[in-house]
Interface confidence: low
């Protein structure tokens, strides 16, 4: 069931309120951006749990088996045992054993480069979104998602892992980006700002939203993450806007109600198990896709990034609940938890729509500059 | 820490309320469950409650008979059991339970239903 | 529901490996937790999301699960391992045992 949370069609770029990079990092919409520091003081991209290894936090779950044989996620070397939520475990920057992760903060050193050479890599995310310069590809089909609608029992780790809020999921929800591209779901995770400033990774003409979810997914190709780490397609992120609408989002109050139990750097919660799906837009035909990477260390490449058109709308007090609740490390407060906007570096993104056409309302006739690349997969 | 009590000897057809006394962690913040251990036997999952009371989950063979409860307040876990049978003899344990397994045990309670 | 099978008994050796399986349909898709009990004592978790081991256990102690199949292994195996150990996993809400496997070292 799909709550009246969503804007109805919302299309991404359709000026709504806030500043543009409000941090003063102008988030150059040109595809030609120019590379910048790898990333300025607040806005940089975190991992996850344990600082895992890349996009926020690689999990702790595995994928459901495959015909052919049973592939699973094992758990990577930064998985802790378990703890009990009411005592911190604050080793968001603890060292683990095969991680070189662990050390890595928004804004300020290292350079992440320095934490991860693949942070300097050519093809980075996030990327400011041009909907003009978007190609229309048709071959883009609906997304699928199957077992999303968890049951309450048992419950799922809430976890504030001093980069973000992290829900891992259990094995069996799947996801298709189309025929043959097939992936399980492992986290989610959100983004977001501070107080009249918005802290969205991905921006649409270089506006940014109040925040954004992540939800990170790996291929059934492969059987652990570190397997799928750089790896084109390896890994896939289905990326939705949080903005501000007028009633209270039910399904983000179940997670955004819990978050005071999680203040502290690296204490966790367990939460009932809910609909994942109603986390996210109920429009599953209309989005951006494109290639890029985790954007946190290590910043592996070859992720899958999907955007949607749709927009989630949260009441004002749940976003301020979002951005105003959470500590993270150095007894500082968790905001500004985003990575700058990365240079396209000739990477063309796709649309699942013909958004050049009725997407942007800057656009004055339809315009369609670059031409879809996915030949139908 | 988990500490269990209630246990005992009751006949056929009674009743019996085991409580489950927590510290050492945040209690209200997790779902709890009850699994038992008959004499010699294997570990049988028996029930299981959310946090906040919200959701109560049952094995088939206790079902309609006993009723898991809370008391956050307390830091209290409860497990009502009524029509008992012979074949509910056994050590009774709270743990919490979560996708990573059980955090912890407690030490356990007997139950005897016997004539 | 999901329903878990392990063998009743295994006995190994000092110092050799000790291998406890667990079947159920399609069980590479559930994560799997192992417990170990003693005689007289509540059980004690040893792996958990098929192969992570909790701060205190010995690195003797690793697990797998693919197929059809999860398995505790135990290398070199001790005199204090002889226990009775639990397979467990989640199915919609409900809590699954295995029916236990007694291991013997000889």
């Known amino acids: 069931q799909r709550l009246p949370r969503m804007q109805e069609d919302s299309p991404l770029g359709g000026g709504s309120s806030g500043e543009d990079d409000p941090l003063g990092e102008e988030d150059l919409p040109s595809e030609e951006d120019s590379p910048r520091e790898e990333d300025p003081p607040g806005e940089e991209d975190l991992p996850g749990e344990e600082d895992l290894p890349g996009e926020e936090d690689l999990p702790e779950v595995k994928p459901k088996s495959e015909e052919e044989g049973s592939l699973k996620l094992e758990d990577l070397p930064t998985v802790e045992a378990p703890g009990d939520p009411q005592e911190p475990q604050n080793n968001a920057h603890r060292d683990k054993e095969g991680d070189d992760q662990s050390h890595w903060r928004y804004g300020g050193d290292p350079p992440w480069p320095r934490v991860s050479p693949a942070c300097a890599g050519r093809f980075q995310s996030p990327v400011d979104i041009r909907p003009q310069l978007a190609a229309f590809c048709p071959a883009l089909r609906p997304l699928e998602l199957l077992g999303f609608q968890l049951p309450p029992l048992p419950e799922l780790r809430l976890r504030n892992n001093g980069h973000s809020v992290q829900l891992t999921l259990p094995p069996g929800l799947e996801m298709a980006l189309g025929p043959g591209r097939e992936y399980r779901a492992l986290q989610l995770h959100l983004h977001w700002g501070a107080a009249g400033r918005p802290g969205s990774e991905h921006t649409v003409e270089g506006h940014r939203f109040p925040a954004e979810i992540h939800v990170v997914h790996l291929s059934t190709a492969f059987a652990r993450v570190d397997e799928a780490l750089g790896r084109p397609g390896g890994l896939a992120v289905l990326a939705a806007f949080l903005e501000e609408g007028p009633e209270e989002n039910s399904a983000y109050e179940q997670l955004l109600s819990r978050l005071e139990e999680i203040a502290e750097e690296g204490s966790e919660t367990q939460v009932p198990g809910l609909d994942i799906s109603a986390l996210l837009p109920s429009d599953f035909s209309r989005y951006f896709q494109y290639e890029g990477s985790l954007t946190t260390p290590p910043c592996a490449q070859g992720v899958i990034w999907t955007v949607f058109n749709q927009t989630v709308m949260l009441s004002a007090k749940q976003l301020h609940t979002l951005s105003d609740t959470l500590w993270g490390p150095g007894d500082s407060r968790l905001q500004l938890n985003f990575r700058a906007t990365q240079p396209l570096n000739g990477r063309v993104i796709e649309a699942s729509f013909p958004a050049g056409v009725d997407s942007s309302p800057r656009a004055a006739e339809p315009v369609q500059l670059n031409s879809c690349l996915a030949a139908g997969d | 820490e988990l500490v269990e009590s209630g246990g005992g000897l009751v006949q056929p057809g009674g009743s019996l309320r085991l409580s489950c006394a927590a510290s050492g962690f945040t209690f209200s913040n997790n779902a709890m469950n009850w699994v038992r251990q008959a004499p010699g036997k294997g570990l049988e999952w028996v029930s299981g409650?959310?946090?906040?009371?919200?959701?109560?989950y049952y094995a088939d063979s206790v079902k309609g008979r006993f009723t898991i409860s809370r008391d956050n307040s307390k830091n209290t876990l409860y497990l009502q059991m009524n029509s008992l049978r012979a074949e509910d003899t056994a050590v009774y344990y709270c743990?919490?339970?979560?996708?990573?397994?059980?955090?912890?045990w407690g030490q356990g309670t007997l139950v005897t239903v016997s004539s | 529901d999901i329903e878990l099978t392990q063998p009743p008994s295994v006995s190994v050796a000092p110092g050799q490996t000790a291998r406890i399986s667990c079947s159920g349909d399609n069980l590479g898709s559930y994560y799997v937790h192992w417990y170990q009990q003693k005689p007289g004592q509540a059980p004690v978790l040893v792996i958990y999301d098929d192969n992570n081991r909790p701060s205190g256990i010995p690195e003797r102690f690793s697990g797998s699960n693919s197929g059809n199949t999860a398995t505790l292994t135990i290398s070199g195996t001790q005199a204090e391992d002889e226990a009775d150990y639990y397979c467990q996993s989640y199915d919609f809400g409900k809590v699954v045992f295995g029916g236990g496997t007694k291991l013997t070292v000889l």
């Open positions: 409650i959310s946090y906040d009371s919200s959701k109560t």
């Open positions: 743990a919490r339970l979560t996708y990573t397994g059980a955090y912890r």
